[in-house]
């Protein structure tokens, strides 16, 4: 131990420590609760949650989605392919979570918590992944211009974008949760 430092171990008591799978499960449920809180504000503020014009705005967004080829569904389940898809998808969602940061008045802290807890989840999952080379990180320049483009939209489109991000992120996490429980 270097001078000026003190190292003290924490000994585990009789209670079983959390496993990697349990902790990841809890982290996803934590984020899902956060999304519910944010969706509540979005739905109270506008009528986006009942809107039928979603397809209009969805064309502008390239939100990550689970597909059959990703190996996360029961048919054709592939643990390694699926884990890569989950991590890649979460990394792609990060720019959209950044966009959400200025979109909430009364839930500003909750939006930040959703963003940060997603970063934590990515870390947990990266520890679990064997094939980190297969994970492509989004290009920062592309993300920056996407963010600028999203922030330049009119108010209605911004509200719709917020609603769609939250809905897609929720669906992606729910699919991830189901898949991870099979691993």
């Amino acid at each position: 131990v270097p001078p000026g430092e003190d190292s003290k171990d924490v000994a585990a008591p009789h209670r079983q420590p959390l496993t990697s799978s349990e902790r990841i499960d809890k982290q996803i449920r934590y984020i899902l609760d956060g999304i519910s809180a944010l969706r509540k504000e979005t739905c109270n503020k506008s009528n986006m949650c009942e809107s039928s014009k979603e397809a209009l705005a969805e064309n502008n967004l390239n939100l990550p989605k689970m597909a059959e080829k990703d190996g996360c569904f029961q048919s054709g389940f592939n643990e390694e392919t699926c884990l890569v898809k989950i991590i890649t998808g979460l990394l792609e969602f990060e720019v959209y979570l950044e966009y959400l940061q200025n979109r909430f008045e009364s839930s500003e802290e909750q939006a930040r918590a959703v963003q940060m807890s997603t970063k934590v989840l990515i870390q947990f999952l990266q520890k679990k992944a064997k094939n980190l080379d297969a994970i492509t990180t989004p290009d920062p320049t592309t993300n920056a211009s996407l963010l600028t483009k999203l922030q330049a939209q009119n108010q209605w489109l911004q509200d719709m974008t917020t609603h769609l991000i939250l809905r897609s992120f929720k669906e992606f996490l729910q699919s991830s949760l189901r898949a991870l429980r099979q691993m």
Partner: nanobody, 125 residues
Framework: GGGGLVQPGGSLRLSCAAS????????IGWFRQAPGKEREGVSC????????YYADSVKGRFTISRDNAKNTVYLQMNSLKPEDTAVYYC????????????????????????WGQGTQVTVSS
């Protein structure tokens, strides 16, 4: 070991490592107990969103951080005062796993399941 005597105004970094489980899965708190006094919560850091909390008595002087790669949590203590003299403990718990948890609750002993054995810090000239 490692704690010991520090002069007023001095600095010390305490580190908390875990044996037998993954520290980054838990909310971590630092507590201290001065002779004849109750154990008090000093600072804590969440495992869910890395948010931090500090007791008023240490705000601006102490910094809590985690290094998940090293499975270690640190408490950097600057501008130490004689009243910081105490036995310091780190603890791990699951107080932060419910979204919307009350951050200030993390300095309550009851929120923790795992405790370190403590280290003496004495601030004196």
């Amino acid at each position: 070991g490692g704690g010991g005597l520090v002069q007023p105004g001095g600095s010390l970094r305490l580190s908390c490592a875990a044996s037998g489980f993954t520290l980054d899965y838990y909310g971590i708190g630092w507590f201290r107990q001065a002779p004849g006094k109750e154990r008090e919560g000093v600072s804590c850091i969440s495992s869910s969103d890395w948010s931090t909390y500090y007791a008023d008595s240490v705000k601006g002087r102490f910094t809590i951080s985690r290094d998940n790669a090293k499975n270690t949590v640190y408490l950097q203590m600057n501008s130490l005062k004689p009243e910081d003299t105490a036995v310091y403990y780190c603890a791990a718990g699951t107080w932060d796993l419910k979204f919307g948890y009350n951050r200030s609750n993390c300095v309550r002993s009851a929120e923790y399941d795992y405790w370190g054995q403590g280290t003496q810090v004495t601030v004196s000239s």
